[in-house]
């Protein structure tokens, strides 16, 4: 018969022959022949291969270097790489997560719209009229101005995006 020019899925062409690829978690030891199947071996400890492959070497699991502020989010298996994340208060610089960035705080006049995670920074928003933030924080939202009326008081000093209103007693008119 004619030698194949293309092979089925999960096969590869070698020496005019279709051989089975090694399954994820295994590496190639020897190609198949007319008489033998492809020989594969499981990846060693701290190694992985995540696709059907003909690799002769497994990849090393990523090392989450604590010196860089990294820690293991998900331990690698023979079929998956280790996933790193950053220690509390920091987030990954990029998707590859090879280093960490300190979470940003929202300055006075701004509140936290979205708290930072291991992969994203704090998102801040300006405090709208009627709200304020007088601290630099990675957690605090804008707070509403105090309602003087509900306390039977009047506004003595108007609020800003950075300060609360100041309430005071009402001037009582004498008869």
């Amino acid at each position: 018969p004619e030698p194949p020019t293309a092979c089925r899925e999960k096969q590869y062409l070698i020496n005019s022959q279709c051989c089975s690829l090694c399954q994820p978690g295994q590496k190639l030891v020897s190609d198949c022949t007319e008489f033998t199947e492809t020989e594969c071996l499981p990846c060693g400890e701290s190694e992985f291969l995540d696709t059907w492959n003909r690799e002769t070497h497994c990849h090393q699991h990523k090392y989450c270097d604590p010196n860089l502020g990294l820690r293991v989010q998900q331990k690698g298996t023979s079929e998956t790489d280790t996933i790193c994340t950053c220690e509390e208060g920091w987030h990954c610089t990029s998707e590859a997560c090879e280093s960490c960035v300190l979470h940003r705080s929202c300055s006075p006049g701004f509140g936290v719209k979205q708290i930072a995670t291991g992969v994203s920074d704090t998102i801040c928003e300006p405090c709208p009229v009627g709200f304020f933030s007088n601290v630099s924080s990675a957690f605090e939202k804008c707070h509403p101005w105090t309602s003087c009326e509900t306390k039977d008081l009047v506004v003595q000093q108007a609020g800003t995006n950075k300060t609360d209103v100041v309430c005071g007693p009402q001037d009582r008119l004498r008869a």
Epitope: D65, N67, L68, G69, E87, E88, G89, T93, S94, E95, A96, E98, S99, V101, L102, R104, S105, D121, S136
Partner: antibody, heavy 116, light 112 residues
Framework: EVQLVQSGAEVKKPGSSVKVSCKAS????????MHWVRQAPGQGLEWIGY????????NYNQKFKDRATLTADKSTSTAYMELSSLRSEDTAVYYC?????????WGQGTTVTVSS | DIVMTQSPLSLPVTPGEPASISCRSS???????????LYWYLQKPGQSPQLLIY???TLASGVPDRFSGSGSGTDFTLKISRVEAEDVGVYYC?????????FGQGTKLEIK
């Protein structure tokens, strides 16, 4: 080998702008933030801010927020620091520094002189 | 902003003798994650700064073990067990607990 190579010295007039470059090599540019620190003559170190080349997201010291612009060009692995409305107090050596587990690599520094 | 205060500002030392530099922060640099975000840098004459110690007490790669860092949340010390001529320069402490990152004024170590 990680290297940060900065552009040459600049002499500028008050009120003008300066743009300093920092070319990175020897590592994946988008995996680390690039910070900028300055040092006035005979003075200490002052942090300006950083750029995250992965997201193009800058974070500034409030003191420089209105005058500094930090950018990064992924295609050339180069970070830039532009400072506008220059005044004599901006005369300093400007450094770029990579943040790994600290400022583990620094550029050689760029001297910016502001003089009329 | 967190204020970093170093002392002394000038430190003349005889080679072979120990040296100690103090750094105080206006706020505790101990994070709830257990790390203390205090760093020490040395700027030798005419050079860019270089890292000595990170996270208060960990020696950076390639730094001689005569250098050591210690401290609590707000009070920190850089010690050199036996000063050598190559140790001259300005030593800076820096906090990276929150933005803006801030440095101490620097301590100039010189040989007597």
């Amino acid at each position: 080998e990680v290297q940060l190579v900065q552009s040459g010295a600049e002499v500028k007039k008050p009120g003008s702008s300066v743009k300093v470059s920092c070319k990175a090599s020897g590592y994946t540019f988008t995996s680390y933030t690039m910070h900028w620190v300055r040092q006035a003559p005979g003075q200490g170190l002052e942090w300006i801010g950083y750029i995250n080349p992965s997201s193009d997201y800058p974070n500034y010291n409030q003191k420089f927020k209105d005058r500094a612009t930090l950018t990064a060009d992924k295609s050339t692995s180069t970070a830039y620091m532009e400072l506008s409305s220059l005044r004599s107090e901006d005369t300093a050596v400007y450094y770029c520094a990579r943040w790994g587990y600290s400022f583990d690599y620094w550029g050689q520094g760029t001297t910016v002189t502001v003089s009329s | 902003d967190i204020v970093m205060t170093q002392s002394p500002l000038s430190l003349p030392v005889t080679p072979g003798e120990p040296a100690s530099i103090s750094c105080r922060s206006s706020k505790s640099l101990l994070h709830s994650n257990g790390n203390t975000y205090l760093y020490w840098y040395l700027q030798k004459p005419g050079q860019s700064p270089q890292l000595l110690i990170y996270r208060m007490s960990t020696l950076a790669s390639g730094v001689p073990d005569r250098f050591s860092g210690s401290g609590s949340g707000t009070d920190f010390t850089l010690k050199i067990s036996r000063v050598e001529a190559e140790d001259v320069g300005v030593y800076y402490c820096m906090q990276h607990l929150e933005y803006p990152l801030t440095f101490g004024q620097g301590t100039k170590l010189e040989i007597k």
